[in-house]
Amino acid sequence: HNTTVFQGVAGQSLQVSCPYDSMKHWGRRKAWCRQLGEKGPCQRVVSTHNLWLLSFLRRWNGSTAITDDTLGGTLTITLRNLQPHDAGLYQCQSLHGSEADTLRKVLVEVLADPLDHRDAGDLWFPGESESFEDAHVEHSISRSLLEGEIPFPPTS
């Protein structure tokens, strides 16, 4: 699996989308998990409703929510009040029995808020986005970055 990068700003919400084949994964619950090390387990953060037909209902675990459009084939995860420690490697999963298929590997990048003058000026620098051989960068609004495009405008 390639890794998709989603960028969000500390204190704001980040929405992660994971597209999938709705027919192939028909009837399957979904989950969002955090990788705990390169060879470690993927620790479940939140999963969709126990009743697959109710997967469209948003379920929360702390500041993380999950909802599944089973017809359209899009799993959506919302990380509310994004914090530095939310940065990390995650997976969208499709569950069947005790097994889990990876729908998408997601790398979450948390940027400091450039408008937070208390300390963001001391922490944030807008780096240029590049195209990577195995990484795809998306904004929290789920728009793909073009090659060479800057994720946020430089501040003077």
Epitope: Q7, W124, F125, G127, E133, A135, L145
Partner: antibody, heavy 115, light 107 residues
Amino acid sequence: QVQLQESGPGLVKPSETLSLTCTVSGGSISSYYWSWIRQPAGKGLEWIGLIYTSGSTIYNPSVKRRVTMSVDTSKNQFSLKLTSVTAADTAVYYCARDLFYFDYWGQGTLVTVSS
Amino acid sequence: EIVLTQSPATLSLSPGERATLSCRASQSVSSYLAWYQQRPGQAPRLLISDASNRATGIPARFSGSESGTDFTLTISSLEPEDFAVYYCQQRSNWPWTFGQGTKVEIK
């Protein structure tokens, strides 16, 4: 097995710019975070900053106005530049992978600031 | 920034003894705390992540625990190679910070 190797001048004059490069082998630099950490002789560890896959950076306020980090994915390298150095910047500088805490480190390179 | 205070500064023990190292955070870091070992002339090595998860290849004699803002690294029975400096580190909030270190020396 991922390996990191720091390289750069071991001696820098005061007020000049310290430049170091970290070369990553045994794996792709993409889809991870990378940090620089330093350690003055006989003292503790200080985190300088990190660079994300996208090239965005987070810097420690203690050095923010003097530091720039960049990444070159084609060479599997990331770099550190620290301007206007003083004797207080003399330390062993480490590069490290930062995704699952600092799970891979370079062996460190000693940078001395002296005229 | 979050300040991590390690105690004691030095711990003098004999091989086979139990070592208990403490790290206290100035504010909550949840479980986002790691422990590293640094031997003389070497780079630090990750021992424990997320307060209690042993890193790959780390012997079972190393364990981590937490209670609020207090974190503990325990080495159940010291081996000769365990005599080194140990650092805690938080990644709950920027900037990432380290404790000042605890030196475990041979008594």
